[in-house]
Interface confidence: medium
Amino acid sequence: QSGPLPKPSLQALPSSLVPLEKPVTLRCQGPPGVDLYRLEKLSSSRYQDQAVLFIPAMKRSLAGRYRCSYQNGSLWSLPSDQLELVATGVFAKPSLSAQPGPAVSSGGDVTLQCQTRYGFDQFALYKEGDPAPYKNPERWYRASFPIITVTAAHSGTYRCYSFSSRDPYLWSAPSDPLELVVTGT
């Protein structure tokens, strides 16, 4: 038995983390020859029957989960994976530090700590060049990110964000960058 029409992909360009007032493009990509696309913001009545949504200036109200599907003839595809569009710069930046320090020997351990003056209960850590956060979202309730048995691959520039689980798509500005240096490799 063949399945239903395969699901399209939905991506945010240049990134799904969008500073307030900056532009972003959401693009739904299905197979060639699609008759109709449906791109929508979940938990709202906002949708459009086009594959591309250009947002010239990111707003708080546009943050949230998006999904798209397409129609060929009378058949609708399975929906795309949900895309979480996050507005950043809504709150003041946290500070990011490394314990015991930003220079660590290969094979050693280091903990990156994201700290904020506000009562945020969620934290996300990003390494420059990696589109995904350093930790699975289900672990974001912790402000500490231990890195056990450091390797050269951990070298790089890190930033963290803080936000509240009550408004999970409204994030702080990124912390100042922290350069992690791995020695003895």
Partner: antibody
Framework: QVQLQESGPGLVAPSQSLSITCTVS????????VNWVRQPPSRGLEWLGM???????DYQSTLKSRLSISKDNSKSQVFLKMNSLTTDDTARYYC????????WGQGTSVTVSS | DIQMTQSPSSLSASVGGRVTITCKAS??????IAWYQHKPGKGPSLLIH???TLQPGVPSRFSGSGSGRDYSFSISNLQPEDIATYYC????????FGGGTKLEIK
């Protein structure tokens, strides 16, 4: 050919934790999500949670505090862990592919009893 | 969370007849509803998704319609092999099943 197969312990003591594995074939876990659904005896279907292709998770709100879903893409396996079991958790547990769950396993029966 | 109220909980009909099951969502689900057939000892089978799109291989005597909060599912020309429990599922925001409808043949 798309297939999903659940494997579980069968019998679990109250207050203990439950671990079930869903082994899939015919599709990639890096692209498709997997849901967990259960059916208590003589009751309807209940959605428990889902792990997406990118590893993010969604849980039913009433179970979120004692439920964890994870996966190993390289082994094509998805894992359900539920803590603090009671007799109300006695059910047949199913894994099913993505939204809106177009392929299902046969289910594995779990009894919570001392 | 979105609640799905499915009715009736059981029904009986004759071979060759027509039955209709309804599901009402607690809020607008924007057509993100699927319908499943569940037989004892098996995993459920997807019949319809996105309100009315039939899964390949599913007979055209199964159909679905609706919008907003109100949706329906029908089987025409009822066959003995249709004996099963049927469920609706909303997947607009997380996932919620209806309570199920047990179909029997007179």
């Amino acid at each position: 050919q798309v297939q999903l197969q659940e494997s579980g312990p069968g019998l679990v003591a109250p207050s203990q934790s439950l671990s079930i594995t869903c082994t899939v074939s015919g599709f990639s876990l890096t692209y498709y999500g997997v849901n967990w659904v259960r059916q208590p005896p003589s009751r309807g279907l209940e959605w428990l949670g889902m792990i997406w292709g990118d590893g993010s998770t969604d849980y039913q709100s009433t179970l979120k505090s004692r439920l964890s879903i994870s996966k190993d893409n390289s082994k094509s396996q998805v894992f359900l862990k539920m803590n603090s079991l009671t007799t109300d958790d006695t059910a047949r547990y199913y894994c099913a592919r993505d939204l809106p769950m177009d392929y299902w396993g046969q289910g594995t029966s779990v009894t919570v009893s001392s | 969370d979105i609640q799905m109220t499915q009715s009736p909980s059981s029904l009986s009909a004759s071979v060759g007849g027509r039955v209709t099951i309804t599901c009402k969502a607690s809020q607008d689900i924007n057509k993100y509803i699927a319908w499943y057939q569940h037989k004892p000892g098996k995993g459920p089978s997807l019949l319809i998704h996105y309100t009315s799109t039939l899964q390949p291989g599913v007979p055209s005597r199964f159909s679905g319609s609706g919008s907003g909060r109100d949706y329906s599912f029908s089987i025409s020309n009822l066959q003995p092999e249709d004996i099963a429990t049927y469920y609706c599922l909303q997947y607009a925001l997380l996932l919620t099943f209806g309570g199920g409808t047990k179909l029997e043949i007179k």
